[in-house]
């Protein structure tokens, strides 16, 4: 009797099992009584990622510079194309369909984890006895100078935005 | 449902060419299968002669040599053979099916 | 050339009683897929072969479940579990895994 449901990588038509089209291929035509499933490869600039039944290819991903986005890794007849972002930019969205500027960290934060082509920069609060003095997307906090080390005595204490200021010691007099 | 019609000369004369067509309804040519033709000559068994696909492509019995040719024509769901220099060993009942579905065979003589 | 032999050439069986007819063929009808395209014809007197069995094992709709098909790679076999008066007629295995098909030579079904 006509089967009702099929093995892996079969689909089920007009009371056939046919074989699935293979990855990097479309369907052609359906299998028969007496013939194969038909399929054929996708072109150049087209891909199919699964064992699958499609009568068109996908169109492989475009990496638009005017977006900012670059090629990470060129798509195959299996794959789409995988898109990143230019130096200084990160994806919006985990598809990467389009980049903004890297954040930078304010006065008073650090960098805790630079961005890269996928994620934006992660800033932390300096923390006591550190500091940020500028905008930046890649400076961590700095640790106030060490007065003590120099021979100098704290004249301003730092905050988290400026470093200390060291100064001479006051001289004892007999 | 499926159904299949050959017509076409029932008598043609030594050398001259057969033609017969197979006109098919309750289903598009250009849509799948094989759409073969097949005879059986007088008391033998069936022979495979050739077929034209859904997509115009064909396939043909070696044992014919270059004398058979099989064509649509879609806008009439319809498709041909043609078997040139004839001679009485192609005297036969002569079918055009997809194999699940055969046509009735349209008996063909070829005698002067 | 796949070659297709069929034994017995003829069977006459009691109705009620069991007909087997064995096909052989001269290569594997297994494809690189896996996949065997052996089928199963009835010429009943005066008419076109219906088609009974595709791809070894598989009943055309309507075809009753007293026939069966089994085989592998070049031997297969049609069974009828129960003959019936209207199962007379020319049985033919038709292999369509190679071209050219090629069919069998037939096995003739009498009622006794």
């Known amino acids: 009797e006509p089967p009702t449901a099929c093995r892996e990588k079969q689909y089920l038509i007009n009371s056939q099992c046919c074989s699935l089209c293979q990855p990097g291929q479309k369907l052609v035509s359906d299998c028969t009584e007496f013939t194969e499933t038909e399929c054929l490869p996708c072109s150049e600039s087209e891909f199919l990622d699964t064992w699958n039944r499609e009568t068109r290819c996908h169109q492989h991903k475009y990496c638009d510079p005017n977006l900012g986005l670059q090629v990470q890794q060129k798509g195959t007849s299996e794959t789409d194309t995988i898109c990143t972002c230019e130096e200084g930019l990160h994806c919006t969205s985990e598809s990467c369909e389009s980049c903004v500027p890297h954040r930078s960290c304010l006065p008073g934060f650090g960098v805790k984890q630079i961005a890269t082509g996928v994620s934006d920069t992660i800033c932390e609060p300096c923390p006591v006895g550190f500091f940020s003095n500028v905008s930046s997307a890649f400076e961590k906090c700095r640790p106030w100078t060490s007065c003590e080390t120099k021979d100098l005595v704290v004249q301003q204490a730092g905050t988290n935005k400026t470093d200390v200021v060291c100064g001479p010691q006051d001289r004892q007099r007999a | 449902e499926v159904q299949l019609q050959e017509s076409g000369p029932g008598l043609v004369k030594p050398s001259e060419t057969l033609s017969l067509t197979c006109t098919v309804s309750?289903?598009?040519?250009?849509?799948?299968?094989?759409w073969n033709w097949i005879r059986q000559p007088p008391g033998k068994g069936l022979e495979w002669m050739g077929y034209?696909?859904?997509?115009?492509?064909?396939n043909y019995n070696p044992s014919l040599k270059n004398r058979i040719t099989i064509s649509r024509d879609t806008s009439k769901n319809q498709f041909s053979l043609k078997l040139s220099s004839v001679t009485a060993a192609d005297t036969a009942v002569y079918y055009c099916?997809?194999?699940?579905?055969w046509g009735q065979g349209t008996t063909v003589t070829v005698s002067s | 050339d796949a070659v297709m032999t069929q034994t017995p050439l003829s069977l006459s069986v009691t109705p009620g009683q069991p007909a087997s007819i064995s096909c052989r063929s001269s290569q594997s009808l297994e494809n690189t897929n896996g996949n065997t395209f052996l089928n199963w014809f009835l010429q009943k007197p005066g008419q076109s072969p219906q088609l009974l069995i595709y791809r070894v094992s598989n009943r055309f709709s309507g075809v009753p479940d007293r026939f069966s098909g089994s085989g592998s790679g070049t031997d297969f076999t049609l069974k009828i579990s129960r003959v019936e008066a209207e199962d007379v007629g020319v049985y033919f295995c038709l292999q369509v895994t190679h071209v050219p098909f090629t069919f069998g030579q037939g096995t003739k079904l009498e009622i006794k």
């Open positions: 309750g289903y598009s040519i250009t849509s799948n299968y094989y």
């Open positions: 034209i696909r859904y997509d115009g492509s064909n």
């Open positions: 099916a997809r194999l699940d579905y």
